[in-house]
Structures are given as structure tokens and as C-alpha cells.
């Protein structure tokens, strides 16, 4: 079973290589446990960037070495991806799964194109 998932079309990472966007889902049921996964699509390859499972009303917990952090509010998840370089530019897709209680629902957003520009190196000062 599926559901609507929304995310912005384009986001520009800041000069420190951090990009944030909101992933929203229209819950068709009363979910208490939600799993959010960020996928990166580049050159028709899809790779998992990070994932977190959380209980409604609680914080998202990503793995300690994850490049993602996030907060949740209702049916919105504010995702932040850190440490991005120009080569990480690509389409970042938000996948949301309502894990519990049944029935299971899953939805995938259209993706957010994240543009990352490596900062110019500072010129040496005399």
C-alpha cells in the first residue's frame, strides 16, 4: 500500500556542504512507527544515503556515523545531509514507510535535486 510523499524539487547546499529539506507524507492511517530513508539517484544507480526509524512524537535517530540528521514534526521530517562535495550533486529521494501498526504503507517522493558547489580555495595571503 502506498501514500503521497512530497519534497522540494531543488535545494542548494551551503558553503559548508550542508543541505536541508523537508520530506512530508500524507499518512493514510494512524502510524506510530515510521521509517525514513534517503536514497541518492545518479546515473540510473540508486544508493541508500541514510535511514532512521522513529516513533511518532520522538526524535529521529540515525547511526552515529551517518551523514544525515533530522527532526520530525507530525507528518513532516526535516532532513539535513552534511559533508557534501560537488561530486555528491544528485537527486536525493525521500522514502517513507509506516511500519506499525498494520497495514504497512510506503511512499516515495519525486526527489530533491541537491546542488553542491565546492568552495573556492582561499588565495594565499602574503
Amino acid at each position: 500500500k502506498a501514500m503521497h510523499v512530497a519534497q522540494p524539487a531543488v535545494v542548494l547546499a551551503n558553503s559548508r556542504g550542508t543541505a536541508s529539506f523537508v520530506c512530508e507524507y500524507a499518512s493514510p492511517g494512524k502510524a506510530t512507527e515510521v521509517r525514513v530513508t534517503v536514497l541518492r539517484q545518479a546515473d540510473s544507480q540508486v544508493t541508500e544515503v541514510c535511514a532512521a526509524t522513529y516513533m511518532m512524537g520522538n526524535e529521529l535517530t540515525f547511526l552515529d556515523d551517518s551523514i544525515c540528521t533530522g527532526t520530525s514534526s507530525g507528518n513532516q521530517v526535516n532532513l539535513t545531509i552534511q559533508g557534501l562535495r560537488a561530486m555528491d550533486t544528485g537527486l536525493y529521494i525521500c522514502k517513507v514507510e509506516l511500519m506499525y501498526p498494520p497495514p504497512y504503507y510506503m511512499g516515495i517522493g519525486n526527489g530533491t535535486q541537491i546542488y553542491v558547489i565546492d568552495p573556492e580555495p582561499c588565495p594565499d595571503s602574503d
Epitope: 512530508e24 493514510p28 507530525g74
Partner: antibody, heavy 116, light 108 residues
Framework: EVQLVESGGGLVQPGGSLRLSCAAS????????IHWVRQAPGKGLEWIGW????????KYAQKFQGRVTISRDNSKNTLYLQLNSLRAEDTAVYYC?????????WGQGTLVTVSS | DIQLTQSPSSLSASVGDRVTITCRAS???????LAWYQQKPGKAPKLLIY???NRATGIPSRFSGSGSGTDFTLTISSLQPEDFATYYC?????????FGQGTKVEIK
């Protein structure tokens, strides 16, 4: 009392553009998915697209892709529909409707007539 | 896209009659995403049934919905004068959301 009130309809020249508004009241606007639906005279209902509660995401029916933009201003409790390159077939009553899946409240509609 | 085909397209009935309208989908639709609306001339549609079988707030018990998969039904158990209108089914996932072509219920 929940209310959705559309405005901005009227006579538009073929090739022109229109911007419709939908003013919401009586509920927490920023919590809801909102859709635009239209109905040509004497015809059935046709879905145009939706916008997510924050306004961060939109989805459009394929036939409107590239010609339509749905936006919202949550500080003003207002939804917008921008439709470009209008043609006679776009003559219809345009409705905004509340709800992610089923639409529990609808506006009264605003009539758009495309004619020279 | 999922096509919804309603039958009949129109029907004539009398007050007190039992009326059944069918909505057939071109592919399976989750009952969670099937709704029915009533529309009267010059007015906006009004939600009757959601989740295929749940009555919306304030809708009289003479309206009921049933079905699953590709076949759904709206039943009016005893037609009242205010029920003469056009009825639409709608599916809301996947996008695009689509409506049936409508069934007009007229006075016999």
C-alpha cells in the same frame, strides 16, 4: 466553520494566463494537503494537482505539467493556482478542495471562461 | 492512469427506491483510497463515503459503500427527494487522482 473561497475567475483571452486564489478559514491551513479540481460546463470532475502542507512539494496531472503551478502562503491561509497558455478547453469551474486523499471540504468554485 | 467507469451513466428512480451505482476500476484500488461524492447543479461536490465504506460526517445512514479491488458500489437504500443529483467515485492513489464520469440520478 471550515471555509474555502475561490476567487480570480473571469474572462481570459486564449494564450493568456490566470491566477486563482483560494482563501481558507476555520481550520489550521498549514496542516492540510490541498488540491485543485476543475469541471468543464456539463462535464465531470478533473484533478489538476496537489500541494503538501508546507508547500514544499507539488504533484500535477500529466496533462497540466509545465503549464500549471500550485503554490500556497501559509501565513495568509491562501492557496494559488497559476495556469498559463490558456485555451478554450480550459473553460471550467475551478475548485480547491481539502484533504490528502478524500476531499472533505470544497470551495464554491470560480468560473474561468477562455474566449476571444 | 487508473480509469474509473461508473454504471449506469444515468438512471430514473422514485422516492423510496433502492438505488445502486457501480464504479469499476481499470486496475486494483486499495479501499483506503476510494471515495464517493454527491453533486447538485451549481454546487460543489460533497463527500459521502471515504475508505470505500465509511460515511462522512453528517451523511445519512441510507448511503452506504462497499467493494474492493476493482469493483465498488454506492447504495442509497431509500431514495429521498434531496438525493436527486450526480454521483462520482474517485480514487486517490496512485496519482493522478481520477474520478468516474458520474451517474445522474433523476426523478422518474
Amino acid at each position: 466553520e471550515v471555509q474555502l473561497v475561490e476567487s480570480g475567475g473571469g474572462l481570459v483571452q486564449p494564450g493568456g494566463s490566470l491566477r486563482l486564489s483560494c482563501a481558507a478559514s476555520g481550520f489550521t491551513f498549514s496542516d492540510y494537503w490541498i488540491h485543485w479540481v476543475r469541471q468543464a460546463p456539463g462535464k465531470g470532475l478533473e484533478w489538476i494537482g496537489w500541494i503538501s502542507p508546507s508547500g514544499g512539494g507539488t504533484k500535477y496531472a500529466q496533462k497540466f505539467q509545465g503549464r500549471v503551478t500550485i503554490s500556497r502562503d501559509n501565513s495568509k491561509n491562501t492557496l494559488y493556482l497559476q495556469l498559463n497558455s490558456l485555451r478554450a478547453e480550459d473553460t471550467a469551474v475551478y475548485y480547491c478542495a481539502r484533504g490528502a486523499y478524500e476531499f472533505d471540504y470544497w470551495g464554491q468554485g470560480t468560473l474561468v471562461t477562455v474566449s476571444s | 492512469d487508473i480509469q474509473l467507469t461508473q454504471s449506469p451513466s444515468s438512471l430514473s428512480a422514485s422516492v423510496g427506491d433502492r438505488v445502486t451505482i457501480t464504479c469499476r476500476a481499470s486496475q486494483s484500488v486499495s479501499s483506503r483510497f476510494l471515495a464517493w461524492y454527491q453533486q447538485k447543479p451549481g454546487k460543489a461536490p460533497k463527500l459521502l463515503i471515504y475508505d470505500a465504506s465509511n460515511r462522512a460526517t453528517g451523511i445519512p445512514s441510507r448511503f452506504s459503500g462497499s467493494g474492493s479491488g476493482t469493483d465498488f458500489t454506492l447504495t442509497i437504500s431509500s431514495l429521498q427527494p434531496e438525493d436527486f443529483a450526480t454521483y462520482y467515485c474517485q480514487q486517490s492513489y496512485p496519482t493522478p487522482l481520477t474520478f468516474g464520469q458520474g451517474t445522474k440520478v433523476e426523478i422518474k
